[in-house]
Interface confidence: low
């Protein structure tokens, strides 16, 4: 019979013959012959591969360096790869999630707007007229001001987005 | 007193590559700064490489991305290497130092440069 | 993409005058903004940053202007030490970019 110039899914074509892929989770010991289908192996300990393959080598696991602030999200099988993620207060820098970054802290006269997750960073926001924020912080958000009125008091500082107001007693008309 | 400063630019033929260094001084890289390369071609403009953070987390630019490659090689050192130069590689290349932290990313301290040329 | 978009790439003006920058993000990035001079074979120096903050040293002549995606540095009084090229850069985010930088503006003062 003529042989094959192209092959069906999960068979690739070598010495002019259509041989069987390997699964999910196995590696490619020898190709098949006239006489013997392709012969596999599962993939040992800490490795795996990911898709129908003809790799003569398993892929490593991904190592999640806790000296780069990483730990495992999900631990990987034969078929899947470990999934890191970043340590509390540490952000990845790629989707890949190969290394950590430390959050962003938010500057006096600015709050926290969205807080820091495992992959992305801490987005904030200026303190609008009313509130206020006085601390560098990765979580805090802007403050409103002190209500002065609410406790009989009067302002005697204004507030700033830095800080609060200072609220004291009224002055009392002597008699 | 502070300083950063950068060595290992050179005139080379395209198809060499090169490891530029970025040496800091008066301060610690192991502190909570980003240092970034950043290149200028001859009349042209800035353009950002990337960053390493002081664990060794980077940052690149999409088209330096798997192309350069930035490492912190002790604690005062910062490399850029850069393979399979070409023309377009002609700059010069600086190193900033970033602050985090402080609620943005800017480069508030930079080297002097050191010129790559890259022509047959 | 994050892209920093400045506007014009050449103004002239005369000392004592006033000029204006103008640079656009493709997308939101609060305040998160700064501004640098660079003179021929010189780094760049930080001249503002949160937008409108002064770095250390630097004159009031220079301002710093606006939010979201939409910012303006305005030279005031102008003097010939003024006259260099100015970048703006986003400070939002690392994140899937291709230049945190601005084109530049290049400015003569006559």
């Known amino acids: 019979p003529e042989p094959p110039t192209a092959c069906r899914e999960k068979q690739y074509l070598i010495n002019s013959q259509c041989c069987s892929l390997c699964q999910p989770g196995q590696k490619l010991v020898s190709d098949c012959t006239e006489f013997t289908e392709t012969e596999c192996l599962p993939c040992g300990e800490s490795e795996f591969l990911d898709t129908w393959n003809r790799e003569t080598h398993c892929h490593q696991h991904k190592y999640c360096d806790p000296n780069l602030g990483l730990r495992v999200q999900q631990k990987g099988t034969s078929e899947t790869d470990t999934i890191c993620t970043c340590e509390e207060g540490w952000h990845c820098t790629s989707e890949a999630c190969e290394s950590c970054v430390l959050h962003r802290s938010c500057s006096p006269g600015f709050g926290v707007k969205q807080i820091a997750t495992g992959v992305s960073d801490t987005i904030c926001e200026p303190c609008p007229v009313g509130f206020f924020s006085n601390v560098s912080s990765a979580f805090e958000k802007c403050h409103p001001w002190t209500s002065c009125e609410t406790k009989d008091l009067v302002v005697q500082q204004a507030g700033t987005n830095k800080t609060d107001v200072v609220c004291g007693p009224q002055d009392r008309l002597r008699a | 007193q502070e300083q950063l400063e950068e060595s290992g630019g050179d005139l080379v033929k395209p198809g060499a590559s090169l490891t530029l260094t970025c040496k800091a001084s008066?301060?610690?890289?192991?502190?909570?700064?980003?240092m970034c390369w950043v290149r200028q071609a001859p009349g042209k403009g800035l353009e950002w490489i990337g960053c390493?953070?002081?664990?060794?987390?980077t940052y690149y630019a999409s088209w330096a991305k798997g192309r350069f490659t930035i490492s912190k090689t002790s604690p005062t050192t910062v490399t850029l290497q850069m393979p399979s130069l070409t023309a377009a590689d002609t700059a010069t290349y600086f190193c900033?130092?970033?602050?985090?932290?402080?609620?943005?990313?800017?480069?508030?301290?930079w080297g002097p440069g050191t010129l790559v040329t890259v022509s047959s | 993409a994050l892209v920093m978009t400045q506007t014009p790439s050449s103004v002239s003006a005369a000392v004592g005058g006033t000029v204006t920058i103008n640079c656009q993000a493709s997308?939101?990035?609060?305040?998160?903004l700064s501004w640098y001079q660079q003179k021929p074979g010189q780094p760049p120096k930080l001249l503002i940053y949160l937008a409108s903050t002064l770095a250390s040293g630097v004159p009031s002549r220079f301002k710093g202007s606006g939010s979201g995606t939409q910012f303006t540095l305005t030279i005031s009084d102008l003097e010939c030490a003024d006259a260099a090229t100015y970048y703006c850069?986003?400070?939002?985010?690392?994140?899937?970019?291709?230049?945190?930088f601005g084109g530049g503006t290049e400015v003569v003062v006559k």
């Open positions: 390493i953070y002081a664990t060794g987390g």
């Open positions: 900033a130092r970033d602050i985090v932290g402080d609620n943005i990313y800017y480069f508030n301290f």
């Open positions: 008066g301060f610690d890289l192991s502190s909570t700064y980003y």
């Open positions: 997308q939101t990035i609060s305040n998160e």
């Open positions: 850069q986003q400070g939002y985010t690392y994140s899937s970019v291709d230049n945190v």
